[in-house]
């Protein structure tokens, strides 16, 4: 009888030990994971994060859709609605260059760098060539008439516009429109001014920055968060807190991301910090990720969202700050009347798009999202969508703008910049991060389950044997 009882008690003890071990492994395992993650996401030589941070292993593409104006004469002569037809995608490979001038500063635990710009046309991913022609707004005419509202100078500009045979609209190739061309009107200015114009001019052989970001050595909760941009903590474009440089550059976030978090990031393309909120769980190539999206609230007017009051910088075009969905970034673009919006004026007020025909906003195609692996904080997939627009206003001194009866925020193009973790990288990520965490969780669950089952089973058997013996 003793042998059997001893065996049952031994089994129960082993079960209890296994269960306790499984239970202990949960916080200990989590601690080990946290320790490993904290070590590997620091931005310093030798870590996984640093290697991928210096040069992204993901192929990033920027697709452009150009808004081809169908009725330039009618607009110029009768102030008609502008009829646009989007043409694209025209795809470029971007962000393929490694970060430059990487300098660690041990004093304040930061790392500074420049992000070089480069774009390579991808014909196989495009609907046409860089030589395709488009009818678009005359960028120089629209910009110059806005920068110089002075009636005297507008007479001078009118003389140059007429002499150069420029008009309100122009025909340009894709390459010219994006990367720059010599403008005939600006070429007549008898002073040393930049005569090259382009939506992204200059781009190739330039760099964004200097960025100075926290490397996470002192506090992992600050990793990749921007300390300064171009040597400053503020942008000098906006009033109050709107001018702050918040969060990371969106390529990664501090680890252990929660669904309840509001992820702040700075985008130099839109000259402001913005934020994303959790939308849904997504499975990306076997990796569980959180999808964060830019909410419509971020583009709301100060009437709808008082937090946005400092992004309203003028009262006329914004109809006393009641318009929404467009951001005037002229201060960031040397006074050129550039307005940023989501493609097809998604989330924008009706008054913004009432002068434009041919737009079809659609949330799925036109919103911006980030797919973030929550444990590491790495952005494994993203789609950054934005539209670049130019304001053109009537001018009684400039002949080609004389017959306009209203202001137009003219869409020039929209872009979709995307990146998705490659299959090989995803496999590696699964085995090194997701796989190990899942395995540890499985072991914990097996130990706990087997231990509890053994303990309960052996204890029941032992009690049953005891009661039989007593009888």
């Amino acid at each position: 009888g003793c042998d059997r009882n001893c065996g049952l008690i031994t089994g129960a003890v082993i079960g209890a030990v296994l269960a306790v071990f499984g239970g202990i492994l949960m916080p200990v395992g989590d601690m080990l994971i946290q320790k490993t993650i904290k070590k590997e996401v620091v931005l310093e030589e030798g870590t996984i994060a640093f290697k991928n941070w210096v040069k992204t292993g993901t192929e990033i593409y920027r697709q452009f859709w150009i808004f081809d104006v169908q009725n330039p004469q009618e607009v110029m002569m009768n102030s008609s609605n502008i009829q646009v037809k989007q043409r694209g995608p025209y795809t470029y490979r971007v962000r393929f260059l490694a970060k430059e001038n990487i300098t660690q500063d041990p004093k304040d635990n930061t790392v500074s760098f420049l992000q070089p710009n480069g774009a390579i046309f991808e014909p196989s991913l495009s609907v046409g060539t860089e030589a395709d022609n488009f009818t678009v707004l005359n960028l120089a005419v629209a910009a110059a008439s806005h920068i110089y509202p002075n009636p005297f100078v507008q007479v001078v500009l009118n003389s140059l516009i007429n002499k150069s045979k420029s008009s309100m609209f122009q025909v340009r190739t894709l390459r010219e429109l994006l990367w720059g061309y010599t403008d005939p009107f600006l070429s007549l200015v008898p002073y040393p001014v930049s005569t090259r114009v382009g939506m992204f001019y200059p781009y190739n052989n330039t760099a964004d920055g200097v960025y100075k970001v926290f490397n996470g050595k002192d506090s992992i909760s600050k990793v990749a968060i921007i300390d300064t941009y171009k040597g400053k903590r503020n942008l000098s474009y906006w009033e109050s807190y709107c001018d702050m440089i918040n969060g990371t550059d969106a390529a990664s976030f501090p680890p252990f991301v929660e669904k309840s978090q509001v992820l702040q990031f700075f985008s130099s393309d839109i000259c402001r910090s913005i934020y994303a909120v959790f939308e849904s769980d997504v499975n990306l190539k076997g990796i569980p990720v959180y999808r964060f999206v830019l909410p419509s609230k971020a583009f709301a007017s100060p009437v709808q969202n008082p937090d946005n009051h400092c992004f309203c910088t003028e009262k006329i075009i914004s109809k006393n700050c009641t318009s929404y969905g467009v951001l005037d970034i002229s201060k960031c673009k040397e006074g050129k009347p550039v307005y940023i919006s989501l493609p097809h004026f998604l989330y924008a007020s009706p008054d913004v798009s009432e002068t434009i025909d041919g737009l079809n906003p659609n949330e799925e195609e036109h919103r911006t999202y980030l797919d973030i692996e929550p444990i590491t904080g790495f952005t494994l997939q993203f789609a950054k969508r934005l539209q670049v627009n130019l304001l053109v206003k009537p001018s009684n001194k400039i002949q080609v703008l004389k017959r306009l009866k209203r202001n137009y925020i003219v869409p020039i193009l929209w872009l979709n910049e995307t990146g998705t973790i490659g299959d090989e990288k995803a496999k590696m990520f699964r085995s090194q991060v997701t796989g190990k965490i899942n395995l540890l969780g499985l072991i914990e669950m097996i130990l706990l389950s087997v231990g509890v089952v053994m303990f309960v089973a052996f204890m029941i058997s032992y009690c049953a044997c005891r009661s039989k013996t007593i009888k």
Epitope: V155, N162, K163
Partner: antibody, heavy 117, light 107 residues
Framework: EVQLVESGGGLVQPGGSLRLSCAAS????????IHWVRQAPGKGLEWVAW????????YYADSVKGRFTISADTSKNTAYLQMNSLRAEDTAVYYC??????????WGQGTLVTVSS | DIQMTQSPSSLSASVGDRVTITCRAS??????VAWYQQKPGKAPKLLIS???SLYSGVPSRFSGSGSGTDFTLTISSLQPEDFATYYC?????????FGQGTKVEIK
């Protein structure tokens, strides 16, 4: 070196005419546009006329509208001010000046026009 | 037409003095104001454009300020060669107009 040289001033009777010339060197007048500014003896400066770049447009002070005409000969790089129906109050030193954005960065030495019987 | 009202019409100052001349536009001209110096028998010389931008070759003791309707020309330390008449001019709208001038004389 940028230079502007006025000529053609002199004594003229009321109702008479005079043509002032402004010869430019060191720049192309058509690119900038030329202004005429006058200064009556012991008085301040008064803007008179302007020909916009590339002969785009001509503007005149109300006091001379319909009597004065500004023109330019790009082949000679010279601007002119044709003054008709001259009055005693037109007596002044006439300067031609170069301007693009409306301020005058180069001035001629001036030519005196005296309207007197 | 935009009227430019300069004050004072004349002032007496000594070498080394700080001199301030003001100019008021009858309507908003933003920063489209120029300042000139003229000596007897000579053509005017540009000192400042866009209200604050010092023209090349002009000594740094000259400075301009203001925007909208009120503008100021300041000579931080008057030099013997600065005794002359000074004019403001708006270059915002045709007809271009000048102030009536401020004569700076030796005290």
């Amino acid at each position: 070196e940028v230079q502007l040289v006025e000529s053609g001033g002199g004594l003229v009777q009321p109702g008479g005419s005079l043509r002032l010339s402004c010869a430019a060197s060191g720049f192309t007048i058509s690119s900038f546009g030329i202004h005429w500014v006058r200064q009556a003896p012991g008085k301040g400066l008064e803007w008179v006329a302007w020909i916009a770049p590339y002969g785009g447009e001509e503007y005149y002070a109300d006091s001379v509208k319909g009597r004065f005409t500004i023109s330019a000969d790009t082949s000679k790089n010279t601007a002119y001010l044709q003054m008709n129906s001259l009055r005693a109050e037109d007596t002044a030193v006439y300067y031609c000046a170069r301007s693009f954005f409306g301020y005058f960065d180069y001035w001629g030495q001036g030519t005196l026009v005296t309207v007197s019987s | 037409d935009i009227q430019m009202t300069q004050s004072p019409s004349s002032l007496s100052a000594s070498v080394g003095d700080r001199v301030t001349i003001t100019c008021r536009a009858s309507q908003d001209v933003s920063n489209w104001v120029a300042w000139y110096q003229q000596k007897p028998g000579k053509a005017p010389k540009l000192l400042i454009s866009y209200a604050t931008s010092l023209y090349s070759g002009v000594p740094s003791r000259f400075s301009g300020s203001g925007s909208g309707t009120d503008f100021t020309l300041t000579i931080s330390s008057l030099q013997p060669e600065d005794f002359a008449t000074y004019y403001c001019q708006q270059h915002s709208n045709a007809p271009l107009t000048f102030g009536q001038g401020t004569k700076v004389e030796i005290k």
